[in-house]
């Protein structure tokens, strides 16, 4: 069964700046990745970025830089300042759509310690 992992890290240089990394552990080819915060995209979450392998990347504030790391993983840097900036207990979710298997999603938040956290 495919799985999605989510890692949330606060940047040491900018304490209110976050990096979210997500990956897909499965055999299908990824068609679309949606990153949201405040919950899953279909359950009240707000979309931060949508990454398509052919048609490019769309992102919305406070997302600063979304990119593909590999064919099955992505990263997203969030701007740290402003009214819409995330806080330490914000939940981030990643949804990977794979054709024709379907979609898998997982959420994660900043771990209690300052060490990078892994959540599946």
């Amino acid at each position: 069964t495919p799985e999605v992992w989510v890692q949330v890290r606060m940047e040491a240089t900018e304490l209110s700046s976050f990096t979210i990394r997500c990956g897909f552990l499965g055999s299908g080819s990824i068609s679309l990745v949606t990153v949201s915060w405040g919950g899953p995209n279909g359950a009240g979450g707000t979309t931060l970025a949508v990454l398509h392998p052919e048609r490019g990347i769309r992102q919305w504030a406070p997302a600063r830089q979304a990119r593909w790391e590999t064919q099955s993983s992505i990263s997203l840097i969030l701007e740290g300042s402003g009214a819409s900036s995330p806080c330490a207990n914000t939940t981030f979710c990643c949804k990977f759509a794979s054709f024709p298997e379907g979609s898998w999603e997982a959420c994660g938040s900043l771990p209690p310690s300052s060490d990078p956290g892994l959540s599946a």
Partner: antibody
Amino acid sequence: EVQLVESGGGLVKPGGSLRLSCAASGFTFSSYHMSWVRQAPGKGLELVSAISRDGDSTYYPDTVKGRFTISRDDAENSLYLQMNSLRAEDTAVYYCSRHEDYFGFAMDSWGQGTLVTVSS
Amino acid sequence: EIVMTQSPPTLSLSPGERVTLSCKASQSVSNDVAWYQEKPGQAPRLLIYYVSHRFTGIPARFSGSGSGTDFTLTISSLQPEDFAVYYCHQAYRSPWTFGQGTKLEIK
């Protein structure tokens, strides 16, 4: 304008074979996942085959697995469905459809359908 | 397999009426739900994708809502051309499945 035009339907005896074709135009065919959906007389819609845009991934329900084969020719902008060992219950209108990644794989374009009748 | 159950199977209504069609999934399908309209002799037509997004050219009287397992398609004021069969569809998990359809007929 997006257009999908099916052909190849007709009357065939049980155990026989047919090859359906779908000619696509008005969009970059190679960038889209494609499917065949059928509707038997008086019944609902059933997805009978799907193929990813790169052609590497395919899907078949148990009802047709081992008998139907989906393929695509991006150079010809065409989708195919090879149907072997046909049964009476395969009688239906067969539609070619296009999936839109950004719409959660919803099928945003359909052909007009081609009728397949399996009868002795 | 995720089963999509539509209700009711048939509805008899008059033009101008408001109608709500129901679709229940046997397990959560996130927001990967679409609605299609089918008329006799015509190909299905996409109305709604991602639960609530109207497809290009679809009139504002059509709206979708729901989350998780319960979804609805609402037509605010039925027009003569709206009498057709409506299908919900999930593309969240393979095998992708359709509901059995709800037929809207003129009273």
